[in-house]
Interface confidence: medium
Amino acid sequence: MMTGTIETTGNISAEKGGSIILQCHLSSTTAQVTQVNWEQQDQLLAICNADLGWHISPSFKDRVAPGPGLGLTLQSLTVNDTGEYFCIYHTYPDGTYTGRIFLEVLESSVAEHGARFQIP
């Protein structure tokens, strides 16, 4: 039975040209995390594998940085980065857990950070 839950940074906003940290945290399960995938709609941004470490998709290498922890940092944001982001936790023996984050990249100089909290 899958008992775990994923906490995420929820709906967040950031300024164009700035950076943002996407974070998810899997709790309430003793399952082993074997891999975490970060995806934007249907595009793979990065993978953190328990044995092979991090892999950043070549097309995002200049704008995506791993961490902190299993999170992902998006840099040099553009309005086109607005959209849904998913953290997909592959675990054993539970299976797959998915968390959703909605990022809005604003043109304005004041981006309100709604539902933003720090997960280690």
């Epitope: 953190c48 092979l52 470490g53 991090w54 950043i56 940085a65 791993p66 299993l70 280690p120």
Partner: antibody, heavy 118, light 107 residues
Amino acid sequence: QVQLQQSGAELVKPGASVKLSCKTSGYTFTSYWIQWIKQRPGQGLGWIGEIFPGTGTTYYNEKFKGKATLTIDTSSSTAYMQLSSLTSEDSAVYSCARSRDGKVVDYWGQGTSVTVSS
Amino acid sequence: DVQMTQTTSSLSASLGDRVTISCRASQDISNFLNWYQQRPDGTVKLLIYYTSKLHSGVPSRFSGSGSGTDYSLTIRNLEKEDIATYFCQQGNTPPYTFGGGTKLEIK
């Protein structure tokens, strides 16, 4: 097998700088974080910071900002830490270590002893 | 910063004994607790990560447990090669802080 080979012991004068190296082998250098840890006798271990060779991203412990600078050379799979404006408080053994996600260090270098003395 | 406290700085035990080393965090660290072994020659090895998961190649006589702020490392059937200093480390919140270490000696 995974190995992190650090440079030899250093004796440096107060006010000087020193650059320590950590040559890695046995794994894909650009896929793991390299962390640096300080150990002084009787004072335990202190986390200095980490660098991700795949992107050059760094995170520092606030206590070491301005003191330590972390860099990498991907062509030789080597990580470096430069320590500046050295004082006797910087005399310690400095270790590099490999980490998948920052939360766990799975392999350590053998450490480099730095002695600051006039 | 999260403070990590190992109240016992040194411990003496006999070969074959069961030994428990404790570590306390100043706040809840959500099981992100690692144990490292530092041999007298300075070599450091990861033993346990995420409270209770055994690192590859580590003998099964080592085990870890705990939650919240209190954690422990247990060594069953103590062997000569286990003579070392043991450090706990929290990986929950940067900067990742270490305990002061517990030096294990043979009686």
